[in-house]
């Protein structure tokens, strides 16, 4: 058993049928010695008397808010949460496996640049009695500071019969140098509590590996005289690291017909313009990627050919 | 990206082209190592990230773009002395900092070159003959060093009398390649920045 925060405790249980559970001793936070009784949650049934209460915690029915009283007055509370270990592996009931980029990915994180700012998000089908708390650091043995905001509900989607809820959090490394070569990964730890169930999820990454630039901005077409060709031009996104000559991007320009089946023409360039053939009803899209370290491509920025 | 690429003109800065070749070569070598050594811990998540140049060179600091010198987090300065002549310096206007930067890059390359050659000698003794260093990568390191053209004491190749532990050597190869790829990215950024200046 360990303390999650003041008066909230997590009991770690080896979770299998007929498991013996864990013996827990609760102590009433009071100078009083006599006439103390204990109850669980809203029940008025007296579980025991005295300054300490010994309980055998086996299942969720044994978890909850234990209260010690004296003469009708509440003296203190202890909330017991359960953390299930199933065959040596901590349970992951609360969050959905996003399966991207690999199985058992519960937290996904992205950064728009090298400033040390990043966003993480996760999915759940649970709509109520749910709280998250996020901590982060650079490295784990001698951790350096990363400050995270509060996790917020950022999207709701309907997936078949289920509603899916997306939560996200923004974090900022306290003293980040965009040009630094990372040798210690960022660690992100999310505590999740649903009713009386506690779970924790972690992710470890280098900022360089989670970079996903914003799409190029000011995408424009300039028709070339007496030709079906057009000059496409664009600019680096505002959110990208500067100077651009150091933090360079490479671009992919795509000409896509109206039908998804039509052949796509693609050109790769390090410049911020390209000459392509504009077909009728087609659209031109451009996306960006770090020129030197191949992390994710940005989303497409698009304009119609007409 | 084996599709049409509009390649930029390397311009007046001869090292840019070599640094791009270097990044391509080390990336290819790392990919080959990951595939060949699939039963070894060779992914970024599994290895310890070690920098053999730590406390010996300070390329990131010496090559910091002017725009980032205002960022206190980037000024984790270390005093290191460097030789300051080199053929990538395009004009006399080149600052002392730029000379320091390029000489730091040269020292990095020299250190990695020695490590890689020592390692290759060990890998050639492996009866499994599982993996060797790409000669193209070693050649590209050499070309960039020649383009930088710094006079520097030659570092003797490390020789070891004891029987090599091939498992450890292969893990060390992965660690070295990951670190060298990261340094190659920095070198490419620096060359691009200097070329644009």
């Amino acid at each position: 058993i360990w303390e999650l925060k003041k008066d909230v405790y997590v009991v770690e249980l080896d979770w299998y049928p007929d498991a013996p559970g864990e013996m827990v001793v609760l102590t009433c936070d009071t100078p009083e010695e006599d006439g103390i009784t204990w109850t669980l949650d809203q029940s008025s049934e007296v579980l025991g008397s005295g300054k300490t209460l010994t309980i055998q915690v086996k299942e969720f029915g044994d978890a909850g808010q234990y209260t010690c009283h004296k003469g009708g007055e509440v003296l203190s509370h202890s909330l017991l949460l359960l953390h299930k270990k199933e065959d040596g592996i901590w349970s992951t009931d609360i969050l959905k496996d996003q399966k991207e980029p690999k199985n058992k990915t519960f937290l996904r994180c992205e950064a728009k640049n090298y400033s040390g700012r990043f966003t993480c998000w996760w999915l759940t089908t649970i709509s109520t009695d749910l709280t998250f708390s996020v901590k982060s650091s650079r490295g784990s043995s001698d951790p350096q500071g990363v400050t995270c905001g509060a996790a917020t509900l950022s999207a709701e989607r309907v997936r078949g019969d289920n509603k899916e809820y997306e939560y996200s959090v923004e974090c900022q490394e306290d003293s980040a140098c965009p040009a630094a070569e990372e040798s210690l990964p960022i660690e992100v730890m999310v505590d999740a509590v649903h009713k009386l169930k506690y779970e924790n999820y972690t992710s470890s990454f280098f900022i360089r590996d989670i970079i996903k630039p914003d799409p190029p901005k000011n995408l424009q077409l300039k028709p070339l005289k007496n030709s079906r060709q057009v000059e496409v031009s664009w600019e680096y996104p505002d959110t990208w690291s500067t100077p651009h000559s150091y933090f360079s991007l490479t671009f992919c320009v795509q000409v896509q017909g109206k039908s998804k089946r039509e052949k796509k023409d693609r050109v790769f360039t390090d410049k911020t313009s390209a000459t392509v053939i504009c077909r009728k009803n087609a659209s031109i899209s451009v996306r960006a990627q770090d020129r030197y370290y191949s992390s994710s491509w940005s989303e497409w920025a698009s304009v119609p050919c007409s | 990206r084996n599709l049409p690429v509009a390649t930029p003109d390397p311009g007046m800065f001869p090292c840019l082209h070599h640094s791009q070749n270097l990044l391509r070569a080390v990336s290819n070598m790392l990919q080959k190592a990951r595939q060949t050594l699939e039963f070894y811990p060779c992914t970024s998540e599994e290895i310890d990230h070690e920098d053999i140049t730590k406390d010996k060179t300070s390329t990131v600091e010496a090559c910091l773009p002017l725009e980032l010198t205002k960022n206190e987090s980037c000024l984790n300065s270390r005093e290191t002395s460097f030789i300051t002549n080199g053929s990538c310096l395009a004009s006399r206007k080149t600052s002392f900092m730029m000379a320091l930067c390029l000489s730091s890059i040269y020292e990095d390359l020299k250190m990695y070159q020695v490590e890689f050659k020592t390692m290759n000698a060990k890998l050639l003794m492996d009866p499994k003959r599982q993996i060797f260093l790409d000669q193209n990568m070693l050649a590209v390191i050499d070309e960039l060093m020649q383009a930088l053209n710094f006079n520097s004491e030659t570092v003797p190749q490390k020789s070891s009398l004891e029987e090599p532990d091939f498992y450890k050597t292969k893990i060390k190869l992965c660690i070295l390649l990951h670190a060298f790829r990261i340094r190659a990215v920095t070198i490419d950024r620096v060359m691009s920045y200097l070329n644009a200046s």
């Epitope: 080896d14 979770w15 299998y16 049928p17 007929d18 299942e59 199933e86 040596g88 058992k104 | -």
Partner: antibody, heavy 115, light 112 residues
């Protein structure tokens, strides 16, 4: 006393369906994940499927994906395996088992797929 | 296809020490716990070892388990005639958990 009692096995023709049941008693069935494991005659153990305690997530071996469906009725304390498009290679003793460091197995039920 | 490899058979005379190996990889045994089961003919498997080296109550102390790197082993110190059975190791793969990974199985024969 934890008990898992299986039923529903038998002889079936290729391409036909069969449903296996596993009745649980002696524990809070709705709190625990459950597996199906099979063993072809003279062969080793092969995992077939898993279902979470609340039925929210199901996992299948590639060999049965799209043909077999694991389900549970927590109000009846029963685990099911619906088997469709059965093949000769599905012939095996099928076991249900609890998930956890200490597990309990059903007695097994024989499924024979033969024309 | 089995990812955990066991020898098809091992044998020993009563009182001898018998060991069964179970070889896997970094993503399974290398990063998960190992269990061992004993299966007597015509019966369901019985848990012998969980958590690499833990014995459930009721399992004789002549059975012991261990794990090192990507391999695990089961030792029977002082093998007895009633130990003649099939033995299976079991673990998980970090990418496919909670799918159970079973070993290929080992037939233990007690001679004489």
């Amino acid at each position: 006393q934890v008990q898992l009692v299986q039923s529903g096995g038998g002889v079936v023709q290729p391409g036909r369906s069969l449903r296996l049941s596993c009745a649980a008693s002696g524990f809070t069935f709705s709190s625990y994940g459950m597996h199906w494991v099979r063993q072809a005659p003279g062969k080793g153990l092969e995992w077939v499927a898993f279902i979470r305690y609340d039925g929210s997530n199901k996992y299948y071996a590639d060999s049965v994906k799209g043909r077999f469906t694991i389900s549970r009725d927590n109000s009846k304390n029963t685990l099911y395996l619906q088997m469709k498009s059965l093949r000769a290679e599905d012939t095996a003793v099928y076991y249900c088992k609890t998930h956890g460091s200490h597990d309990n197995w059903g007695q097994g039920t024989m499924v024979t797929v033969s024309s | 296809s089995y990812v955990l490899t066991q020898p098809p058979s091992v044998s020993g005379t009563p009182g001898q020490r018998v060991t069964i190996s179970c070889s896997g990889g970094r993503s399974n045994i290398g990063s998960n716990l190992v269990k061992w089961y004993q299966q007597l003919p015509g019966t369901a498997p019985k848990l012998l070892i969980y958590g690499n080296d833990q014995r459930p109550s009721g399992v004789p102390d002549r059975f012991s388990g261990s794990k090192s790197g990507t391999s695990a082993s089961l030792a029977i110190t002082g093998v007895q005639a009633e130990d003649e059975a099939d033995y299976y190791c079991q673990s998980y793969d970090r990418g496919t958990h909670p799918a159970l990974l079973f070993g290929t199985g080992t037939k233990v024969t007690v001679l004489g």
